[in-house]
Interface confidence: medium
């Protein structure tokens, strides 16, 4: 576990878990329901999600200088998606297939966020936008868009942890 004061996380563990997250996010994507091409729209669901951006210190130089900025951003995103996957968007009708990896994905998001959470210190988490749909027909598209956005997020996180494991591990 990472500790306050800028200590490093268990980079190798984080790398392994983030790679698992990537695999799960891609395998969950087609299983959330058959996407209908009639369903479209702007990326509303991703407007408010945590993005890993240039100023977040997730580049190699930023990670070397102080990895905590980047890790906090990743942690925020993990908590954000963990909450979304536990919401009625995913738990409500239409039910997910019994073998859907969404449950595993949810647990892995929580697991990685716990690896990053410093002992005795709580990073500020981002508010979830009000996306709770009242009707089942709305959920299929939201699931699709959330998972598509999650795929992009965990891909970046996995690259960060791969770099950290290769160059920053003690």
């Amino acid at each position: 576990r990472a500790v306050p004061g800028g200590s490093s996380p268990a980079w190798t563990q984080c790398q392994q878990l983030s790679q698992k997250l990537c695999t799960l996010a891609w395998s969950a994507h087609p299983l959330v329901g058959h996407m209908d091409l009639r369903e479209e729209g702007d990326e509303e669901t991703t407007n408010d999600v945590p993005h890993i951006q240039c100023g977040d210190g997730c580049d190699p130089q930023g990670l070397r200088d102080n990895s905590q900025f980047c890790l906090q951003r990743i942690h925020q995103g993990l908590i954000f998606y963990e909450k979304l996957l536990g919401s009625d968007i995913f738990t409500g009708e239409p039910s997910l297939l019994p073998d859907s990896p969404v449950g595993q994905l949810h647990a892995s998001l929580l697991g990685l966020s716990q690896l990053l959470q410093p002992e005795g210190h709580h990073w500020e988490t981002q508010q979830i936008p009000s996306l709770s749909p009242s009707q089942p027909w709305q959920r299929l598209l939201l699931r699709f868009k959330i998972l598509r956005s999650l795929q992009a997020f965990v891909a970046v996180a996995a690259r960060v942890f791969a770099h950290g494991a290769a160059t920053l591990s003690p």
Epitope: R38, N47, W137, Q138
Partner: antibody
């Protein structure tokens, strides 16, 4: 009292365009998803399109996909349906409806669109 | 797409009669079914939502039942104002589809 009032219908030639409006009152419009539904003369009901409360997500029936565009202006409490490349089979009464706790809980009175040469 | 099939297409009844209309979905829609009443020249009016929940302001003589693929709308004692066309509709998945309608006429 919830009220939905459609306007903008009329006679248009095949291939022409029309924009329908649905003025909403009596509720916080920006909190609700909305639908357009149509009914050809003497026929049943057909769902046309739906839109997310902020307008960022839209859904369409196959029969109108690529020709119709649903949109909304939450500052004006108004829902729109832009209809292009109109065909005779688009002739119908067009209704807007609200997605409340019960879907399609309130409907407007409808506006008639006639596509004919 | 989920097809909704109503039966009968029309029926003749008298005031005071008990009337039952059925609706069948082509696949499981759980309980996500609405019933509407439409009178000539008027917009449809929501009667029942989620298969069995009476919409506010709708008389208690209307009731709905069913889940999965088979659903029923019952009018326990038909009143003069109940002669109309009734539609079922699934709100489970896009495209949202309606039954073809059942016309309730005066016998």
């Amino acid at each position: 009292e919830v009220q939905l009032l459609e306007s903008g219908g009329g006679l248009v030639q095949p291939g022409g365009s029309l924009r329908l409006s649905c003025a909403a009152s009596g509720f916080t419009f920006s909190n609700y998803a909305m639908h357009w539904v149509r009914q050809a003369p003497g026929k049943g009901l057909e769902w046309v399109s739906s839109i997310w409360p902020s307008g960022g997500i839209t859904w369409y029936a196959d029969s109108v996909k690529g020709r119709f565009t649903i949109s909304r202006d939450n500052s004006k409490n108004t829902l729109y349906l832009q209809m292009n490349s109109l065909r005779a089979e688009d002739t119908a009464v067009y209704y807007c409806a609200r997605v409340g706790a019960a879907d399609f809980d309130y409907w407007g009175q409808g506006t008639l669109v006639t596509v004919s040469s | 797409d989920i097809q909704m099939t109503q039966s009968p297409s029309s029926l003749s009844a008298s005031v005071g009669d008990r009337v039952t209309i059925t609706c069948r979905a082509s696949q499981n829609i759980n309980s996500f079914l609405n019933w509407y009443q439409q009178k000539p020249g008027k917009a449809p009016k929501l009667l029942i939502h989620v298969a069995s929940n009476l919409q506010s302001g709708v008389p208690s003589r209307f009731s709905g039942s069913g889940s999965g693929t088979d659903f029923t709308l019952t009018v326990s004692s038909l009143q003069p104002e109940d002669f109309a066309i009734y539609y079922c509709q699934q709100t489970y998945s896009i495209p949202l589809t309606f039954g073809q309608g059942t016309k309730v006429e005066v016998k």
